[in-house]
């Protein structure tokens, strides 16, 4: 946030921008949390936008049973390695088909034991609060579905009649990895020494970073006339004087009209 | 890239027999699986004949004992030689390759086809 400042008085202001603002001939250049023309105010919002989606990775190995090995399959650039890779992606597409946050799969090795498979099962579902949940049900969901093709899918007198076949002894989930994002996390870091007075609150599932400075949220500070303003002892009301009245108290909601007091004060003369 | 041309189809009288083959250009023909596949009105395509670089071999049940898959790789070509034929053989044969050695009947797994060439068998 800048303000643009004109006349003699510009040379003082450079030599004044707080809060690491930076004066860059105009006005002060003031950091994310500040704004103001001297960055002297603390913002109310911070921007935490979660990223749009949030990913997961489940490492599986897998017995092919239906290939047998050769040592072109190790090489990633064989043509052997090209049209197994075809073969098994479309095999696990067809076993993944029902889950929504099904991305691909991507092989890391083959080796031999008729061909194991090592790769990498790939899940993906857009940013809500409840990411954690729906990408555990989806691993879950993942296990049981190449539980039951492994199981079903296996070679009778040494033949195949599917697209893959598997040894179902051979089918083990390595390790689940799940990006992590947490707002509130975020939300603490980027408020920097004013971390304790910012909280997250959701909007449209969304998550807002914001003081009791930012309007319209439920931990608001309702300053009715006055200014919210943020320091390092929390959010302060500064309260406002007008032509009749005077505002005091924690949220500016004791007005004091001036007419009374002079008054008050031309009866005690 | 493999590339297939089957060729030999044509019709003939029950009992009687047929060679078709399959020509392949663009790679060795040492290495991984062949077959012939056949699709009749109305069906799915089903694995006929197929054999493997490492000498394995498979015959669907009702063309056991009467047709012999075989290849000549000085020639890169692939054969079917059908014998006894019957009406229920007249179909639309195919050859397929796979540089993978495979042991399956199903079509999804093999990654090249030939054109296909039509067998008919009248009584």
């Known amino acids: 946030r800048t303000t643009t400042c004109f006349g003699d008085g510009c040379q003082n202001t450079a030599s004044r921008c707080k809060n690491g603002g930076t004066w860059d001939g105009l006005k002060c250049q003031c950091p994310n949390l500040y704004y103001g023309e001297l960055c002297e105010e603390v913002v109310s919002s911070i921007d935490i936008g979660p990223p749009e989606t949030i990913s997961a990775q489940m490492e599986l190995t897998v017995t092919v049973t239906s290939v047998k090995f050769t040592e072109e399959l190790k090489n990633h650039s064989s043509q052997e390695f090209q049209e197994f890779k075809q073969t098994f992606t479309e095999q696990m597409n067809i076993v993944y088909s029902g889950i929504p946050e099904y991305v691909g799969v991507n092989i890391t090795k083959l080796r031999l034991g008729s061909v194991v498979v090592e790769h990498d099962v790939l899940l993906r579902t857009k940013y809500t609060p409840e990411y954690k949940t729906v990408l555990d049900n989806a691993t879950e969901v993942v296990k049981e579905k190449i539980t039951k093709v492994t199981t079903q899918q296996i070679m009778i007198n040494d033949i195949c009649s599917d697209m893959m076949c598997f040894n179902t002894t051979g089918t083990q989930v390595q390790n689940i990895t799940v990006t992590q994002y947490d707002p509130e996390e975020d939300c603490r870091k980027m408020a920097k020494e004013y971390g304790d007075y910012f909280v997250v609150e959701y909007r449209d599932q969304k998550p807002y970073c914001i003081s009791p400075c930012e309007p319209g949220f439920s931990v608001s500070k309702n300053c009715n006339l006055g200014k919210c303003q943020m320091s390092l002892s929390g959010p302060q009301c500064l309260c406002v004087t007008t032509e009749t009245h005077w505002y005091s108290g924690e949220t500016c909601n004791q007005g004091t009209q001036k007419s009374l007091v002079y008054g008050h004060h031309h009866h005690h003369h | 890239e493999v590339q297939l041309q089957a060729s030999g189809g044509g019709s003939v009288q029950a009992g009687g027999s047929l060679r078709v083959s399959c020509a392949a250009s663009?790679?060795?023909?040492?290495?991984?699986?062949w077959g012939w596949f056949r699709q009749r009105p109305g069906k799915e395509r089903e694995a006929v004949a197929l054999?493997?670089?490492?000498?394995?071999?498979f015959y669907a049940d009702s063309v056991k004992g009467r047709f012999t898959i075989s290849q000549d790789n000085t020639k890169n070509t692939l054969y079917l030689q059908m014998i006894s034929l019957r009406p229920e053989d007249t179909a639309m044969y195919y050859c397929?390759?796979?540089?993978?050695?495979?042991?399956?009947?199903?079509?999804?797994?093999?990654?090249?086809w030939g054109q296909g060439t039509q067998v008919t068998v009248s009584s």
């Open positions: 397929a390759a796979s540089v993978l050695v495979l042991r399956t009947l199903n079509p999804k797994a093999w990654h090249h």
């Open positions: 663009g790679d060795t023909f040492s290495r991984g699986s």
């Open positions: 054999i493997s670089s490492d000498g394995w071999t």
